[in-house]
Interface confidence: low
């Protein structure tokens, strides 16, 4: 390999290097490649040089396109007709000189916050692009359409947020915002101007016309209308609070809808239980006043007893299933019918047949094993399933089992 590289001179974006050739293994070196490494790079990376192509008789080159105020080390790799050789030992580590910052913060945005606040956020400039010590940000903002910019200096490279608080800031009003950069060398550019809205006011009116109905023992559907009166504060969605009659309201669970949806389903509830529900509008500032509370009782739970005494027999491409009627207990929903679930043994998707009888006839090909289960259904939902029944592949036309 070539002998270790020497850094002869370094500027903010360039480094002049020299090296002595190593042994060529009896095949002349045709070119050299320069590689660089920084604390921020993943391993060694090829860099641009002047001359762009370094022939085998050249032992000096200038690396260009470096980042200011970054620690670099360099090495060379020699190549000949046989291939690429071992890299040289790395040079000493040297830091490029400082320069004015050139990269502006990305994703300047903001919004939200508390009353009378303008929240401005941005992505910090990575350390390797700060170009010098003493890096910081200049936050500039003005009410949309006004002439004069207000400026705030944040002398911290880690700053990613600025909050302007003033009673004169109206809720959800637009501001033009830009964020500039500076370091010890001076001020750099500003980001493009973007529009950010001040903190909004939480909704001031409650939703109207709350109505809830029980769908099953476990599910409730809630409906409401957007506030009837003129509401201040943008509505981003609604929050539905629900709690059991025997629980405290502060233990209520909450679910949120997004957008102008004015109904939602609440699931995983207990059967035969009185629930209280209330709805609020919300936005980024918080929630508005609560609607009146409505009450709804979930339906009785579905039958807990599974269908029993299941008998099957087959004839003429049919499987006939019979089972005992399921009787609902006093605290259970009345049986409305039965669901017969079946699938091929090799197939994961399940087919369902509903019947209000205690028997069913399935027309199925006989060259497969079947898995069958039966469960009652009711207003309270589906009841307990029977044990799975495996009906084996039937080679003859008649078979029976239980």
């Amino acid at each position: 390999p070539p002998e270790a590289v020497t850094i002869d001179e370094i500027t903010d974006t360039t480094a002049q290097l020299s090296w002595r050739p190593g042994p060529d293994n009896h095949s002349p070196i045709t070119m050299y490649v320069i590689q660089a490494r920084t604390p921020f790079s993943v391993g060694w990376q090829a860099v641009s040089t002047v001359p762009e192509l370094i022939d085998g008789k050249t032992f000096t080159a200038t690396v260009v396109g470096l980042n200011p105020w970054v620690e670099y080390e360099f090495r060379t790799v020699a190549a000949n007709v046989i291939g690429i050789g071992e890299p040289s030992r790395p040079s000493e580590k040297r830091r490029t000189e400082e320069a004015l910052p050139e990269v502006t913060p990305a994703n300047v945005s903001g919004g939200g916050g508390s009353k009378s606040e303008l929240v401005i956020t941005w992505e910090t400039v990575p350390e390797e692009l700060q170009n010098g010590r003493g890096f910081g940000y200049v936050v500039a903002f003005r009410p949309y359409g006004k002439m004069i910019w207000m400026l705030t200096v944040l002398a911290s490279a880690d700053a990613s947020r600025y909050v302007f608080r003033n009673e004169s800031v109206h809720p959800f009003s637009p501001f033009e915002v830009k964020v500039g950069v500076f370091n010890n060398k001076g001020e750099g550019p500003f980001s493009p101007t973007t529009v950010v809205y001040s903190a909004e006011e939480e909704p001031t009116k409650p939703p109207a016309s709350i109505f809830a109905r029980s769908l099953s023992a476990t599910d409730i559907e809630v409906f409401w209308a957007s506030p009837l009166e003129k509401n201040r504060g943008r509505i981003q969605g609604y929050e539905v609070k629900y709690w059991r009659h025997e629980d405290k309201e502060e233990n209520a669970r909450k679910i949120r809808t997004v957008g102008n949806q004015t109904s939602t389903k609440i699931t995983n509830l207990k059967g035969s239980v009185l629930y209280h529900l209330a709805v609020k509008a919300y936005n980024s500032a918080g929630t508005g006043p609560s609607s009146a509370t409505v009450n709804v009782t979930t339906r009785k739970p579905p039958p807990s007893q599974p269908p029993g005494n299941i008998i099957w027999n087959s004839s003429d491409s049919k499987i006939i299933l019979n089972w005992d009627q399921v009787k609902a207990l006093d605290n259970e929903s009345e049986v409305k019918g039965y669901k017969v679930l079946y699938r091929w043994n090799r197939q994961s998707s399940t087919s369902v047949i509903e019947t209000n009888k205690t028997s069913v006839e399935l027309s199925l090909p006989f060259d497969e094993d079947y898995i069958i289960e039966i469960k009652p259904f009711s207003d309270g939902g589906d009841g307990s399933s029977s044990e799975q029944i495996r009906i084996p592949k039937i080679s003859n036309a008649y078979a029976r089992g239980s």
């Epitope: 929050e239 405290k248 233990n251 669970r253 909450k254 679910i255 918080g286």
Partner: antibody, heavy 123, light 107 residues
């Protein structure tokens, strides 16, 4: 039983990057918010970062915002904290924690904690 | 920031109340959690979450309440093994935070 096991923190150099992984078991991982909380020697608890069950929302304390990234792999039931540009004040014990409910979030809702892993940032 | 007293003390069997204030109305509620730490560097234990919910393995002498912007942890019939630092957790208007901790000494 819920268990939260943090990877070893160890000695880190200032300006470097720290990656901590918490392996969770005993609950439906993808349903719960997960947290990183730290404690400097002789100091109190400090909220660091939080991630929603699906991973779509993240929250950070101002002290680490811009330096920290919290992420999760629901397939592996792991949550990761990446903390860059380490400082001496990042020294402390880092705890992984989970939210108590699938519907609540924030520093008021933690119900389970890992044993913690010690991180020392020093040159 | 959340504010809590730096220390409280009580005799065994007495009732202790630790308060936490400074929480901000956040997404429809003031929420506080309470976390017990028996020695620095040992894992905290949740005694109350979301104002008044107690994990199943926590004794019933621990209870919590939230009234406006103040949360309260109550230990009814304090015992020697309850001696620890108690931290409240909540939202202070800009970020989720923990209080500085209250040292409970059982005399």
């Amino acid at each position: 039983a819920v268990t939260l096991d943090e990877s070893e923190g160890g000695l880190q150099t200032p300006g470097g990057a720290l990656s901590l992984v918490c392996k969770a078991s005993g609950f439906t991982f993808s349903s719960f918010n997960m947290f990183w909380v730290r404690q400097a020697p002789g100091k109190g608890l400090e909220y660091v970062a939080e991630i929603s069950g699906g991973g779509g929302s993240t929250w950070y304390a101002p002290a680490v915002k811009g330096r920290a990234t919290i992420s999760r792999d629901n397939g592996q039931s792991t949550v990761r904290l990446q903390l860059n540009n380490l400082r001496a004040e990042d020294t402390g014990t880092y705890y992984c924690a989970k939210s108590a409910d699938t519907w609540s979030y924030g520093a008021a809702t933690i119900d389970a904690w890992g044993h913690g892993t010690e991180v020392i940032v020093s040159s | 920031a959340l504010t809590q007293p730096s220390s409280v003390s009580a005799n065994p069997g007495e009732t202790v109340k630790i308060t936490c204030s400074g929480g901000t109305y956040s997404y429809g509620n003031y929420y506080y959690g309470w976390y017990q730490q028996k020695s620095p560097g040992s894992a905290p234990v949740t005694v109350i979450y979301n104002n008044n919910n107690r994990p199943s393995d926590i004794p019933s002498r621990f209870s919590g309440s939230g009234s406006g912007s103040t949360g309260t942890l109550t230990i009814t019939g304090v015992r020697a093994e309850d001696e620890a630092v108690y931290y409240c957790g909540g939202y202070d208007g800009s970020t989720d935070v923990f209080g500085a901790g209250t040292t409970l000494t059982v005399l």
